[in-house]
């Protein structure tokens, strides 16, 4: 509550951050023109990424492009990218849809289209749908703790949001257990409302906000977090504003002295810890 | 303007940016003592890294060392690096600007030079100038698309910069399309009277600032943001505080059981995304 | 100090920082059951990542698990993990510790235990102690150059922590040279009361904070950020929370048709750059 | 049905070589560990050699240094070459693998077995 006889003193703060959880991935497989089932678990180090400070990735999906090399390929038949002629197509020219640079030629995509070669890293990308249910779905069970210290300097105060009373097998529940510090992926969702098994799907932005109202004066003392969900991403985007989180990254090897590369697209949940609030002081 | 009646509240804000563009990158290549013309693409995968948050990286330049392995050679030979004795080398001895500890002896660096021998990923990496142009140069032409969402929690207030009116195809300009949340890095460049050309060889910071000042009383609601752009990193640097923006990173491979790395210096341009305002409401 | 007439504002802030240093690494290593001696250096692209923003991470420790498969294996005899029949062991079940699912069948782990059998990345990784003291433990030695860029837009007003007359060479003291931007991390941690070599096994965050408080009147113009530094993560954190800094990541590569992964759980310092201030201008 | 189908068997002089091969066929999701083990006649079966999906290798102590298990993951084979052979080798030689079948359905499989034998 406002205190107007207070100074008032913004938080200055720092977040860790620690995931745990695993996910087993059940996958079709081709290899060698054989398309057979593929297991496999992801644990930390496969699903999440060394990330600094506010804000932290779980992976909940992914399309990967393998064994892509710098060659000329005919490019991906999106809407509006087939050829009948050479004269469609134009030298040096860079569709920014596009993963690479046009030779000029049209060239066979398949027994049935054609579009226009490009140099780049082929084949390339296929404009494929993310998988339906997702593929790390199950890291709606995942957990997070969340560490937060945090300093008022003006008022020469400092603390955090783990007490050395705090039981490390909690997990944060609304009513029960609003101080606990590790909460479940989903529970995230579900109290911001949102779907966990969709948002997965194509990815996306969820803010945990830590809001720190203190009274530092010694007659009553108050400095406690209080969490709170929202999602920060536009679930009705339109597509041309690339709806969800995704990023692209890639694994390079050489083999037979060529250079290669398996292209990742991870869709994800990134989580952004909004830290805000005030110390008040007489 | 400043309502004094009204209650101010800072902003709470996400970032979520999305590069896209491709480079095609033509350099000399040396393999087995042969030197040849590469041309390679790259794309996003290759340029830019899984970021988090307010900033996202491109790199418009490298310098490569391959190969490298752990083992005994002599140091590069920078100014006052030379030898001609053992007695100017010190067993142990770690000079900053070197890459290794020196074992004491002075060994042919090449034919007329002699350097300290070092134990250091080897052949060290030679402190040769960015290549002039810029490798990547042609980043001038990609785009960002930044997505901001902002929060004033006392107001229980949410917005976005992009509006569900706004055409997915635009590009930012100052005058004709203030609002448009997609940039060319060149054109950021421009508005803050820099040399994106120029910038791009050793590398550089800039700013995108995203004001927002609302006023979110109901009788003259308004709540938009004004974009604007500064370099942050200094260009008139001496050279002994590191002018510009770089960073080493390695690519680790193993080859007849030894295990080697290939070492990258990335120049580029770091964007930084400074979201600043305040929410005033009655 | 508080002037009550002048309109205060925050600060808009920008980091950049470089990490100088290399650190000689002497551990045992085995290959093909032979136990020896191994030694190398570690540089800048091998301790620390390409982070953006206002963190730097340092890796001072680090466990590795090599040549890990998925497969089937033992899982690590953790308390209480031992079994000694099959009904121990529930297939299909993810025990957040462990680091795979079960088979439901209880195999021999080694000579003398028996642990229940999961899919996982295999041999699961091995929960040992981090290495004391610490493998880089020199790291007290690696400088960090801190460049800040600061803005008050209300006031159009910008400046830096690093002014044309400094001198390259110098190394931050709080009595000598209190206004140096190139810190020596052993002596950061020695202003925060801390002990480096201690910190380094576990690793642990430390802050840096800059706080600027400016007076932009002319006639009375002051604006020099200060420098004070303190530790951020809790040293008496009970076990469960996770104490110190630490994240796993892995290296891909495929040998004999198989995917392998070798996984570092890299213990470090996570330095977290705090900027806060204000300009007060009349 | 699974199937392992083991070769290479046959009589050599002591000080001699031999290279034992066995190949796991049907339909199945993923070999994992895969050893050998030797039964001599009159005496309890015992290990050889295994060898994980990974390739870490495990030896008996009176087979270390002389024999070595490998494997191929693309043809699910696994091979023993035996060096330095002694009269006391001499036994039938059995392929083990243990397969998953399904997701998290392992099962334990045994080769028929291939006769070694070891002259003095």
């Known amino acids: 509550s406002d205190k107007l006889y207070q100074r008032k003193e913004p938080v200055i703060s720092s977040v860790h951050t620690k995931v745990k959880g695993i996910a087993e991935v059940t996958e079709n497989v081709t290899e060698g023109g054989v398309t057979k089932l593929g297991h496999s678990i992801f644990d930390t180090a496969d699903y999440t990424f060394p990330l600094q400070g506010n804000s932290f990735f779980v992976m909940t999906n992914y399309v990967k492009s393998e064994g892509q090399v710098q060659t000329l390929c005919p490019e991906y038949p999106r809407r509006g990218a087939q050829c009948s002629s050479d004269r469609r197509c134009k030298k040096g020219w860079m569709d920014p849809q596009s993963k690479g640079i046009q030779t000029g030629r049209c060239v066979p995509y398949d027994k049935t289209r054609k579009t226009c070669e490009v140099s780049a890293w082929c084949p390339t990308e296929e404009e494929k749908e993310a998988p339906r249910p997702a593929l790390l779905r199950s890291a709606e069970n995942f957990t997070v703790l969340i560490k937060n210290n945090i300093h008022f300097p003006g008022h020469n105060y400092t603390t955090r949001n783990i007490l050395p009373t705090m039981n490390g097998s909690c997990t944060f529940h609304k009513t029960w257990d609003p101080q606990c510090s590790i909460f479940r992926l989903g529970d995230i969702f579900q109290e911001a409302g949102e779907n966990f098994t969709e948002v997965a799907v194509q990815g996306g932005i969820m803010g945990i906000e830590i809001y720190w109202d203190c009274n530092l004066d010694s007659w009553s003392h108050h400095c406690r977090p209080r969490y709170s969900f929202r999602r920060l991403d536009d679930k009705n985007m339109d597509e041309s504003f690339v709806p969800g989180y995704n990023f692209r990254y890639a694994k390079y090897y050489k083999e037979n002295n060529v250079e290669k590369r398996t292209l990742i697209k991870a869709f994800g949940i990134r989580f952004d810890i909004l830290v805000f609030g005030t110390g008040g002081k007489f | 303007s400043d309502k004094l009646y009204q209650r101010k509240e800072p902003v709470i804000s996400s970032v979520h940016t999305k590069v896209k563009g491709i480079a095609e990158v033509t350099e000399n290549v040396t393999e087995g003592g042969v030197t040849k013309l590469g041309h390679s693409i790259f794309d996003t995968a290759d340029y830019t890294f899984p970021l988090q948050g307010n900033s996202f990286f491109v790199m418009t330049n490298y310098v490569k060392s391959e190969g490298q392995v752990q083992t005994l050679c002599p140091e590069y030979p920078r100014r006052g690096a030379q030898c001609s004795s053992d007695r100017r080398c010190k067993k142990g001895w770690m000079d900053p600007q070197s890459k290794g500890i020196q074992t004491g002896r002075c060994v042919p660096y090449d034919k007329t030079r002699k350097t300290c021998e070092v134990s250091a990923w080897c052949p060290t990496e030679e402190e040769k100038e960015a290549p002039r142009p810029a490798l990547l140069r042609s980043a001038e032409n990609f785009t960002v698309l930044i997505k901001n969402n902002i929060h004033f929690p006392g107001h229980n207030y949410t917005t976005r910069n992009i509006l569900p009116t706004m055409n997915g195809s635009c590009t930012f300009h100052k005058t004709w399309d203030p609002q448009c949340s997609i940039f060319r890095l060149g054109d950021i460049f421009q508005e803050a009277g820099e040399n994106f050309t120029e910038v791009a060889v050793q590398g550089g910071i800039m700013g995108i600032e995203i004001y927002w000042d609302c006023n979110l009383d109901s009788w003259s609601h308004h709540c938009r943001p004004r974009y604007s752009f500064r370099r942050l990193d200094d260009k008139n640097m001496d050279e002994s505080f590191v002018p510009g923006y770089n960073f080493r990173y390695a690519k680790y491979y193993k080859e007849n059981n030894v295990e080697k790395r290939t070492l990258i210096k990335a120049f580029g341009i770091r964007f930084d995304i400074l979201v600043f305002g305040t929410g005033g409401k009655f | 100090s508080d002037k009550l007439y002048q309109r205060k504002e925050p600060v808009i802030s920008s980091v950049h920082t470089k990490v100088k240093g290399i650190a000689e690494v002497t551990e045992n290593v085995t290959e093909g059951g032979v136990t020896k001696l191994g030694h190398s250096i570690f540089d800048t692209a091998d301790y620390t990542f390409p982070l953006q923003g206002n963190s730097f991470f340092v890796m001072t420790n680090y466990v590795k698990s090599e040549g890990q498969v998925q497969t089937l294996c033992p899982e690590y005899p953790r308390r209480g993990a031992q079994c000694s029949s099959d009904r121990r062991c529930k297939k299909g079940w993810m025990d957040p510790q462990s680091k795979g699912i079960q088979t439901g069948r209880c195999v021999p782990y080694d000579k003398t235990r028996k642990t229940c059998e999961v899919s996982a990345w295999c041999p699961t990784e091995e929960e040992k102690e981090a290495p004391r003291p610490a493998l880089l433990r020199s790291a007290e030695n690696f400088t960090v150059l801190i460049k800040n860029n600061i803005h008050f837009p209300g006031h159009n007003y910008t400046t830096r922590n690093i002014l044309p007359t400094m001198n390259g060479s110098c190394t931050f003291h709080k009595t000598w040279d209190p206004q140096c931007s190139i810190f020596r991390l052993g002596d950061i941690f020695q202003e925060a009361g801390e002990n480096f070599t201690e910190v380094a096994v576990q690793g642990g965050i430390m802050g840096i904070e800059i706080y600027w408080d400016c007076n932009l009147d002319s006639w009375s113009h002051h604006c020099r950020p200060r420098y004070s530094f303190r530790r951020l993560d809790d040293k008496n954190m009970d076990e469960s929370f996770v104490p110190g800094y630490n994240f796993r990541y892995a290296k891909y590569y495929k040998e004999n048709n198989v995917e392998k992964r070798t996984l570092i759980k890299a213990f470090g310092i996570r330095f977290d750059i705090l900027v806060f201030g204000t300009g007060g201008k009349f | 049905e699974v199937q392992l189908v083991e070769s290479g068997g046959g009589l050599v002089q002591a000080g001699g070589s031999l290279r034992l091969s066995c190949a796991a066929s049907?339909?199945?999701?993923?070999?994992?560990?895969m050893a050998w083990y030797r039964q001599a006649p009159g005496k309890q079966r015992e290990l050889v050699a295994d060898?994980?999906?990974?390739?870490?290798?495990n030896y008996a102590d009176t087979v270390n240094g002389r024999f070595t298990i490998s494997r191929d993951n693309v043809r699910n084979t696994v091979y023993l070459q035996m060096n330095s052979l002694k009269p006391e080798d001499t036994a039938a030689y059995y392929c083990?693998?243990?397969?998953?079948?399904?997701?998290?359905?392992?099962?334990?499989?045994w080769g028929q077995g291939t006769q070694v034998t070891v002259s003095s």
């Open positions: 083990y693998a243990r397969i998953e079948l399904g997701v998290l359905e392992p099962r334990d499989y």
């Open positions: 049907g339909n199945f999701f993923r070999v994992n560990t």
């Open positions: 060898i994980t999906r990974g390739d870490r290798t």
